[in-house]
Structure formats: structure tokens, C-alpha cells
């Protein structure tokens, strides 16, 4: 059962796992949610009736029954982890805590103009978990405007004390705001020789990499595969760090793989969600329950629905035993990973999918692409919306993309002559325009946010956000697309598609069924040669075939140029302008979304 409200002046008795320090009860709840075993917590707020050494303590708790006895205690705030909830969760914490000093290892001290600059510095420093900034009112003259970057083993402060005229806050890496490089390469036959901060068991290098990514101290990892010669080290995932933030060297070893934490690009890749099944593999751990199940998929569902289950092993039924049902072993451990992994015993293992909601919804796998043909099928492009105007009569105006549960990203030029958001309707989950009737549900638009440097499509800044009046409930037919990561500017996208209900040729009409076309990206240099009379800036991106024939056209404007990278779809472009449609040597020009990520985040995350 999902309980989101906090219980004031209430303490949960017993069930303690560990104690951490957090600046607020709200953040204590987030820490509890991300902890592999925590189901409940008790936070102690600052209070004259409470011993100051206990202020800001966040006691993480577990219980077999998923609840604990409640005791009245002033200044105590208790609550439940969001593990029990189905809604999206995020570790992103932008709050600034006034007059609080969050203690940790002060490894970097420098002058900063503001707390915001200090937070940015922390976000762009590979080691930084949180910071404390002495404001210009700070009593000690030599400490004024000093920005202290801090880290700890756990990523949370070792203590929090009251201190006038300072502010503290957390790194915004988990908000996808870091400018650090995102190194996605996995290095085969490679060991990184630096210091190990932890080790866990993992079934493959990808799970090892994801564990590294959400471990606060891990910067890179080495994984020993099941073919590793030393039996005791097989499936071992070594979580590593170094002073420089990079491995000091690489050593060649067969059957080992190494890679990097993806903490600075984690918004657009699944990090917590290990959705694969591992055949002929047994995960060992503390047994929670043994249940009969028809298949390994059914076993995974049972694990996902059991809040304390972290991973499972399914043993298929022997011949016609037990109505063809196998045994589903639901398991857990102290760190969420198997204590040992065994091969060759015939089991099928995997992880709970409960943690998938901690990843951005946009990373969820969608229906496989339908190859060939130009008409889309339902659920193929679940982020695509049709934007209608009701004035003077209702009609399709532009495309758009869902990027958040209240946000649509589209082109600024769509709103020429649109006086008010009241005349706009956003329809999601639509395949055919003919589905839209009088009674078809839609989202009203609360606000149109056009980039303030926009003048006309051809001169750039052709980007706009629509804030919806109500939130979108994500389903298979309507869900967001990931924004590209700023750390991914170097990525070459090779699987890009443009979609829309627009014209199929220059003189045509809006199409009934959502159309799709796979289109290669064109370098800006090449594009500039094709548009001598225009300036193709780095804030634009071009796509098209040299011979023409496939392109976006009138009515597709504002819609997505979607590119698949590392199994995740990214909104690389917004359909903006072009010379004619699908003309030879006239690529389509799109707004280069990666260049506007800061603008998007600034507008969508404004308080």
C-alpha cells in the first residue's frame, strides 16, 4: 500500500537498518526509497526538546510486516518509502538548505559568486555529493563566498549542524544537469587497477555498470565474467574510484570487462531497472518466499509485487508435476544484489521491476519498430502528440512530443497568430486523426512558452514548450521521450525517424494515419552547402537523403526527430523548416534539442 504523507510527532519503533543524516524529512524519504531494504523511516527535526546531536538523523527501517509500532515523540517525523508506490520517483533534489552545514570530507574549497554557482561546481565535479557555501553575510571575513565541495562514502552528510549565514545543497547530477562527459564505452578484456570501494555480485557487465552508476562513490568498475579463470571471483563486480576521477591505468585480462559510472548521463538510460532474464543461472540470497509459478515471467511479476523481494530464481516444473508450475524463489540481500551467482543448475533468474520507476519513464522499452511501410502502428511513437487549434474550426496544427507529465515540446513557429492557449488542444495516444471526435479526451494548454530569441524558423530558436492543464498518466500509448544528454554531443545517431500527420508532398492534405520515415542525419557543413542563403547554426540539425524522397512536410512541424541510441529513444530534433519537401539535396532542418536542454530544464523545473 502506498502511503505518501508524513506522520508528524511520530516515531517508528524498532526495525533499524542504519542511520544517515538528511536536511529534511522529505529527503529522508527519498534516501529510504533508494536504499535496497528500507521500507519505513523516522526523521528527527531540529527542536529545543531534542538533543542537537540527534537533529537531522534519518533512521532507515525494515519490517517483515511492512509496518512497525508507532510511538508519539515530539520533533520526530516518520513515513514510508516510495517503494510501495507506483508513481515515478527521482533522486533529484534542488532544494537549498539555509543555515545548515552538511558535514563531509571537504576536498575542494574555492570562491564562488553565489550558492547557485557553488551548486553548479558541485554538479560538474565528479567526486562531489553535496556542498556548503558561506554567504557574504558570514561572520568570518576570510570564509565569505567560500564554496566547499564535499563527499562521503554514502553520498549523504556524516552530520548536519546549524550554522548561521551558510547554505547547503546537493549535486544535481541526478537531475541530468551535469556537464561531465558521459563515457558509455565498455572495454572488453580490460581491468581497471584502482582502489575498490565495494564489490557486489552481478550477472553481467551491464548490471555491474548500472550498480556502479547508482552507487555514490563508484566512478568506474571492473567485472569478472563467468568464464573468469579464478572461480571465487566469477561474476564479481568491483566498484572503483580514483583521485583523478579516471582509471590510472588499464590492464589487459581475458574474460574481464570494465567501464564507467553513468552518473552524469543517467537520466536517459535505465540505471535501476535490470529487466533481463538470466538462463541457467541461480541467484543466491536470503529466501523470502517460495511460490508456484507458471513461468519465469510470472515469477518476476510475483517478485515485483512483493515489496521486499529484490531478485528471484525460477526453477521450471519437472515434466507434468504441480500442474506444470515451477518453483519461484523470492529473495533479498543487504545490498539488493545476489550473495552468489551459480551457473549450470537450470534456474532462470532476474530482478524485481519495482525499481524501474526510479528510472526516467522515457527509458522504458516500447513496441519494436515496424520495418518497411510508412504508416505507423499504435504505440509505436507514444511520445508523439497532435496539437489542434479550435479557431476558427478545429484542425491539426502541429506535432509535438511528450517530455514530461505536464510538458509538450514543439516548434515556436506553430504559434504564429495563436493569441491564447485556450484555443489549443493536445491529443495523445492517437494513431488516426479520424479517432478525434467531440467527446475525445484531450489536454488543455495552461501556458505557451516560446524561446525569447525566436523570430522566425529559419533563423533558429524554433522551440516552444506547452504546459498542460492536467498531468498525463503514462501508458503504453502515451509516454515521454528522453531528451539527449549534454554529455552525448559526440554521439552519432544512426537510427533516426521523423513522424507526423503532415503532407506527403508539397501540395497535399493532412494525413489520417501517423506517418513515419527513417532519415539519416546530415552534417552541418553538408547542410550549409545545401542552404547557401541561410545560416545553419550549431543549434540546428539537418536530416535527409541526398536524392530526397523522404522528409518532413507541412503539418509535421513541431513533431519529433526521434533517434534510438543504446536501446533508448532520444528527442534529437524538432521539425522546423526546409526548402520544399523531400527535394533532392535539400535536407530538412530541425531544432537541435541538445543545445536547448538547459533552457528546457530551466522552464520545466521552475518553481
Amino acid at each position: 500500500e502506498c502511503v505518501t504523507q508524513l506522520l508528524k510527532d511520530t516515531c517508528f519503533e524498532g526495525g533499524d537498518i542504519t542511520t544517515v543524516f538528511t536536511p529534511s524529512a522529505k529527503y529522508c524519504q527519498v534516501v529510504c526509497t533508494y536504499h535496497p531494504r528500507c521500507l519505513l523511516f523516522t526523521f528527527t527535526a531540529e527542536s529545543p526538546s531534542e538533543d542537537p546531536t540527534r537533529w537531522f538523523t534519518c533512521v532507515l527501517k525494515d519490517s517483515v510486516t511492512e509496518t512497525l509500532p508507532r510511538v508519539n515523540r515530539t520533533a520526530a517525523i516518520s513515513g514510508y518509502s516510495f517503494k510501495q508506490c507506483s508513481h515515478q520517483i527521482s533522486a533529484c533534489n534542488k532544494d537549498i538548505y539555509v543555515d545548515l552545514d552538511m558535514k563531509g570530507i571537504n576536498y575542494n574549497s574555492s570562491v564562488a559568486k553565489s550558492a547557485q554557482e557553488c551548486q553548479e561546481r558541485c554538479t560538474d565535479d565528479v567526486h562531489c555529493h553535496f556542498f556548503t557555501y558561506a554567504t557574504r553575510q558570514f561572520p568570518s571575513l576570510e570564509h565569505r563566498n567560500i564554496c566547499l565541495l564535499k563527499h562521503t562514502q554514502t553520498g549523504t552528510p556524516t552530520r548536519i549542524t546549524k550554522l548561521d549565514k551558510v547554505v547547503s545543497g546537493f549535486s544535481l547530477k541526478s537531475c541530468a544537469l551535469s556537464n561531465l562527459a558521459c563515457i558509455r564505452d565498455i572495454f572488453p578484456n580490460t581491468v581497471f587497477a584502482d582502489s575498490n570501494i565495494d564489490s557486489v555480485m552481478a550477472p553481467d557487465a551491464f548490471v555491474c555498470g548500472r550498480i556502479c552508476t547508482h552507487h555514490p562513490g563508484c566512478l568506474f568498475f571492473t567485472f569478472f565474467s563467468q568464464e573468469w579463470p579464478k572461480e571465487s571471483q566469477r561474476n564479481l563486480c568491483l566498484l572503483k574510484t580514483s583521485e583523478s576521477g579516471l582509471p590510472s591505468t588499464r590492464i589487459k585480462k581475458s574474460k574481464a570487462l570494465s567501464g564507467f559510472s553513468l552518473q552524469s548521463c543517467r537520466h536517459s538510460i535505465p540505471v535501476f531497472c535490470h529487466s533481463s532474464f538470466y538462463h541457467d543461472t541461480d541467484f543466491l540470497g536470503e529466501e523470502l518466499d517460495i511460490v508456484a509459478a507458471k513461468s519465469h515471467e510470472a515469477c518476476q511479476k510475483l517478485c515485483t509485487n512483493a515489496v521486499r523481494c529484490q531478485f528471484f530464481t525460477y526453477t521450471p516444473a519437472q515434466a507434468s508435476c504441480n500442474e506444470g508450475k515451477g518453483k519461484c524463489y523470492l529473495k533479498l540481500s543487504s545490498n539488493g544484489s545476489p550473495t552468489k551467482i551459480l551457473h549450470g543448475r537450470g534456474g532462470i533468474s532476474g530482478y524485481t521491476l519495482r525499481l524501474c520507476k526510479m528510472d526516467n519513464e522515457c527509458t522504458t522499452k516500447i513496441k519494436p519498430r515496424i520495418v518497411g511501410g510508412t504508416a505507423s502502428v499504435r504505440g509505436e511513437w507514444p511520445w508523439q502528440v497532435t496539437l489542434h487549434t479550435t479557431s476558427p474550426t478545429q484542425r491539426h496544427l502541429c506535432g509535438g512530443s511528450i517530455i514530461g507529465n505536464q510538458w509538450i515540446l514543439t516548434a515556436a513557429h506553430c504559434f504564429y497568430g495563436v493569441e491564447s492557449p485556450k484555443i489549443l488542444r493536445v491529443y495523445s495516444g492517437i494513431l488516426n486523426q479520424s479517432e478525434i471526435k467531440e467527446d475525445t479526451s484531450f489536454f488543455g494548454v495552461q501556458e505557451i512558452i516560446i524561446h525569447d530569441q525566436y523570430k522566425m524558423a529559419e533563423s533558429g530558436y524554433d522551440i516552444a514548450l506547452l504546459k498542460l492543464e492536467t498531468t498525463v498518466n503514462y501508458t503504453d500509448s502515451q509516454r515521454p521521450i528522453c531528451l539527449p544528454s549534454k554529455g552525448d554531443r559526440n554521439v552519432i545517431y544512426t537510427d533516426c525517424w521523423v513522424t507526423g500527420w503532415g503532407y506527403r508532398k508539397l501540395r497535399d492534405k493532412i494525413q489520417n494515419t501517423l506517418q513515419k520515415a527513417k532519415i539519416p542525419l546530415v552534417t552541418n557543413e553538408e547542410c550549409q552547402k545545401r542552404y547557401r542563403g541561410h545560416k545553419i547554426t550549431h543549434k540546428m540539425i539537418c536530416a535527409g537523403y541526398r536524392e530526397g524522397g523522404k522528409d518532413a512536410c507541412k503539418g509535421d512541424s513541431g513533431g519529433p526527430l526521434s533517434c534510438k541510441h543504446n536501446e533508448v529513444w532520444h528527442l534529437v530534433g524538432i521539425t522546423s523548416w526546409g526548402e520544399g519537401c523531400a527535394q533532392r539535396e535539400r535536407p530538412g532542418v530541425y531544432t537541435n534539442v541538445v543545445e536547448y536542454v538547459d533552457w528546457i530544464l530551466e522552464k520545466t523545473q521552475a518553481v
Partner: antibody, heavy 118, light 107 residues
């Protein structure tokens, strides 16, 4: 067919700078780790620097650390070596090469000569 | 850092001969060694990796052996096109190091 074509070499004074480029074709450049290897006149081979496919991690020989910067532009299929504070001992033919899973330099360019002399 | 020493620094042989070049690492490098051939004015060419695995397209008269610190490159039945300089390279860890080279010339 894999092709690597270096350019940008030439005569430069000690303390000066030079930027080498290596244009790649015939393979998926963004999938490969790349490197620069040099060879002083009449001498052996010396590894200079490497860069991972994403460009996010670079490695350097001690002899060039702090003076040379390797980079790549995957959209242009091009590898670069920015050489600053050049010394006479940096005089060499500079080769661009692909670094394979075998931990060997699979393919090489034809090289570009850099001469540092006053 | 690992240093590589090749011997001899030069060797004279005739067409049809069998030639052996050795390479020694300053510390154990398992079987992580590569061999290259370089002709005057040309770029090096990878011949062998992992001490004994022939790179595709390389004639079978080239063979490599060894592990730990001592390695050899053997060329059976020398052909005119085999006269060149040969380099070994440790592929155990960064920084990557090459041997100083062995010049194979016609007797």
C-alpha cells in the same frame, strides 16, 4: 577499405603549437578507440596518446602529458592532436592508428612529419 | 611502467632462411604481446597479437610464441618482401611500450 589520412604536420619553432588531424573512412569511426603513435627519424615507435570511442577518456605518454591534447569529432570522422610547447625531441612522423580489442594497432595512416627546429 | 627489449638489433639472412627475433619484457605480461612489420617510408603493419595469434591476411610463415617475459617471432622460409624492421609491443597495460626494433636485412 579502412583509410586514415593524417594532415597538419610541418616545421614549427620550439615552444610553438601545431594541430594534427586524421580523417577516417571505411569503418564506423565512432565504435573505435583511436591513438597517435610517433617515430623520430631513424628511431623506433613511441605511443603518444589514446582516446576512447565516446571521447570522454584520454590517455597520454608521460613525455607529452600536459602539452598534447587528443580529441575526436565523431560527426566528422576525425581525430585530432593539439601539440603545444613543442620541443626538438617531438620531431617525428606522427601516425594515427585504430586500437583494437586485440590491444594492438590494427590500422595505420601514412603519417605526417612534424619538425621542431629554430 | 613496462619496458621492452628486442634482440638482436639487426640480423642478416638470405631468402629461404628461418629467422628468430626475441623480445623481453621488464615484468611478466602474460601472453599480451603484439608484433609489427615496418618497411622504409611506410606505416607499421600488425602481424601477430596475443603472442601467437596471426592477424588476418598475414602469411602463415610468420609465427609467435612465448609468455611471461620472453617472446619470439619466427619467420620461416624468408621471402624478399619480408626484409623490414620488426617491432614488439607489450599489450598488458598502459602506457603502451614498443621494443626498439630489429632490422632484418638481406645477407
Amino acid at each position: 577499405e579502412v583509410q586514415l589520412l593524417e594532415s597538419g604536420g610541418g616545421l614549427v619553432q620550439p615552444g610553438g603549437s601545431l594541430r594534427l588531424s586524421c580523417a577516417a573512412s571505411g569503418f564506423t569511426f565512432s565504435d573505435y578507440e583511436m591513438a597517435w603513435v610517433r617515430q623520430a627519424p631513424g628511431k623506433g615507435l613511441e605511443w603518444v596518446s589514446s582516446i576512447v570511442p565516446s571521447g570522454g577518456w584520454t590517455l597520454y605518454a608521460d613525455s607529452v602529458k600536459g602539452r598534447f591534447t587528443i580529441s575526436r569529432d565523431n560527426s566528422k570522422n576525425t581525430l585530432y592532436l593539439q601539440m603545444n610547447s613543442l620541443r626538438a625531441e617531438d620531431t617525428a612522423v606522427y601516425y594515427c592508428a585504430t586500437w583494437g580489442d586485440s590491444w594492438g594497432f590494427d590500422f595505420w595512416g601514412q603519417g605526417t612529419l612534424v619538425t621542431v627546429s629554430s | 611502467d613496462i619496458q621492452m627489449t628486442q634482440s638482436p638489433s639487426s640480423v642478416s639472412a638470405s631468402v629461404g632462411d628461418r629467422v628468430t627475433i626475441t623480445c623481453r619484457a621488464s615484468q611478466g605480461i602474460s601472453s599480451w604481446l603484439a608484433w609489427y612489420q615496418q618497411k622504409p617510408g611506410k606505416a607499421p603493419k600488425l602481424l601477430i597479437y596475443d603472442a601467437s595469434t596471426l592477424q588476418s591476411g598475414v602469411p602463415s610463415r610468420f609465427s609467435g610464441s612465448g609468455s611471461g617475459t620472453d617472446f619470439t617471432l619466427t619467420i620461416n622460409s624468408l621471402q624478399p618482401e619480408n626484409f623490414a624492421t620488426y617491432y614488439c609491443q607489450q599489450a598488458d597495460s598502459f602506457p603502451i611500450a614498443f621494443g626498439q626494433g630489429t632490422r632484418l636485412e638481406i645477407k
